[in-house]
Interface confidence: low
Amino acid sequence: TALSPTPTTMTFTPAPLEETTTRPEFCKWPCECPQSPPRCPLGVSLITDGCECCKICAQQLGDNCTEAAICDPHRGLYCDYSGDRPRYAIGVCAQVVGVGCVLDGVRYTNGESFQPNCRYNCTCIDGTVGCTPLCLSPRPPRLWCRQPRHVRVPGQCCEQWVCDDDARRPRQTALLDTRAFAASGAVEQRYENCIAYTSPWSPCSTTCGLGISTRISNVNARCWPEQESRLCNLRPCDVDIQLHIKAGKKCLAVYQPEEATNFTLAGCVSTRTYRPKYCGVCTDNRCCIPYKSKTISVDFQCPEGPGFSRQVLWINACFCNLSCRNPNDIFADLESYPDFEEIAN
């Protein structure tokens, strides 16, 4: 390579303002906004500025930020003004850094994912370890299987169900059943040397606003693991849900807007209106997470060009969970929740 490698990082510190302790005014009233909002890079949030005036592209990690040019709330960024003492006028967008975790004597950094063994995938989040079971709640095959057996498979970590009356089941039904069965949660079932597998949906990539959730499934013609994705929106970013909590109550588990609206995605609009339910907030340090949900298909029509459809998380109910410290860690201790099947699906 042209420049000999030595990994290193250099961060940008904002140039100090002229030597004065007066803070500049970044907000102007009445609001003065350009006629058309800026076009943001793909994947960057278009948000209302800190002055509550104009639409701006959210500042990202390492960008300058002010009370007007605010950091991307969807990416867990905050404005670090420490490099601009004593005015604290221009900062740099920084990641909220949490504390690490210790498990079985091993220290993990905040955000680090690891597998303590072959059965669990864990993530350290703000001092707490949340784990996703990799051998998820195996259940015996249903309907056609009268003699299920739970067996260990050589070279594989997770136990599997096999059906001793395989020879007697109708071929077509078996295939359909296996597929419906696999799609209902993270389960494994042998079918002609193919173990059908569908993982649970990953947590939504954002705690508010539009995010992405993914899962791995080999329920396809090739029995090949493929990543499926769906859009998710746990709660709107621009609504202060706490204002909707009734007096004397500690939470509003489900928030639902009064009117049905269209979903919008990259300038394209859903062909019909929806009145989605969102997860609310819990004001007593519990976190509000989806409890019953499903995936729906939403058709979008674009102003120019063809339309398209996308899978979207549809929330039926949410609840305030005591053990979940990270608002997005919806798979911690999953199996102890009621209606696990509906959460996984």
Epitope: M10, T11, F12, P38, R39, C40, P41, L42, G43, V44, C57, A58, Q59, Q60, L61, G62, D63, D72, R75, V92, S205, I212, T214, Q227, S229, L265, A266, G267, C268, C302, F308, R310
Partner: antibody, heavy 119, light 110 residues
Framework: QMQLVQSGAEVKEPGSSVKVSCKAS??????LNWVRQAPGQGLEWMGG????????NYAQKFEGRVTITADESTNTAYMEISSLRFEDTAMYYC??????????????WGQGTLVTVSS | QAVLTQPPSVSKGLRQTATLTCTGD????????AAWLQQHPGLPPKVLSY???SRPSGISERLFVSRSGNSASLTITGLQPEDEADYYC???????????FGGGTQLTVL
């Protein structure tokens, strides 16, 4: 290791169209962009797409004549230019944006696809 | 016509220091910062720095990037023959809604 693999070189006649592909390994939620470089010239952004969303974003200059599409299942982006002109002769690069779309640059690049427009 | 302005060429001696500049406006470099790319003949560009002035792992510590207002600069110390290449700055322009590039600077190591 993240890789972008582009389709092979093309020789086309003026007025025809060409479709170049770019297959990305890994996550399909990163924007894939198309950048061209005419012989001896600088880099010029044409547009981009996030395969998982499927909605493209074009540079004004190329709007209408260039179509960018993606196949989410194979994590492949396509760039088609219609009504080819001699001045479209260039190396066409596919480039992926990195984490934190607003500050990471186009951090992974394909090997390039040479499109020659000749009569 | 490139949106960002770079000097067409810079020549420096072996083991000397070269500083390349890139000037834009408040909707690109001034707003988002600039990234730097290096391109050797016949090869695709390679990222040297991110727009927050940090470097990807594996990029030499002989390289320094900085930004002041609407301008960014790339400094390479202790120049080596392999540093001879074209260098481009790039930024996202929020008013154009597009990635923009400089015209490129050809660095010659004498």
């Amino acid at each position: 290791q993240m890789q972008l693999v582009q389709s092979g070189a093309e020789v086309k006649e003026p007025g025809s169209s060409v479709k170049v592909s770019c297959k990305a390994s890994g996550d399909n939620s990163y924007p894939l962009n198309w950048v061209r470089q005419a012989p001896g010239q600088g880099l010029e952004w044409m547009g981009g797409i996030i395969p998982i969303f499927g909605t493209p974003n074009y540079a004004q200059k190329f709007e209408g004549r260039v179509t960018i599409t993606a196949d989410e299942s194979t994590n492949t982006a396509y760039m088609e230019i219609s009504s080819l002109r001699f001045e479209d002769t260039a190396m066409y690069y596919c480039a992926r944006e990195g984490d934190g779309y607003n500050y990471s640059p186009l951090d992974y690049w394909g090997q390039g696809t040479l499109v020659t427009v000749s009569s | 016509q490139a949106v960002l302005t770079q000097p067409p060429s810079v020549s420096k001696g072996l083991r000397q220091t070269a500083t390349l500049t890139c000037t834009g406006d408040s909707s690109n470099v001034g707003n988002q910062g600039a990234a730097w790319l290096q391109q050797h003949p016949g090869l695709p560009p390679k990222v040297l720095s991110y727009r927050n002035n940090s470097r990807p792992s594996g990029i030499s510590e002989r390289l320094f990037v900085s930004r002041s207002g609407n301008s960014a600069s790339l400094t390479i110390t202790g120049l080596q023959p392999e540093d001879e290449a074209d260098y481009y700055c790039s930024a996202w322009d929020s008013s154009l809604g597009a990635w923009v590039f400089g015209g490129g600077t050809q660095l010659t190591v004498l």
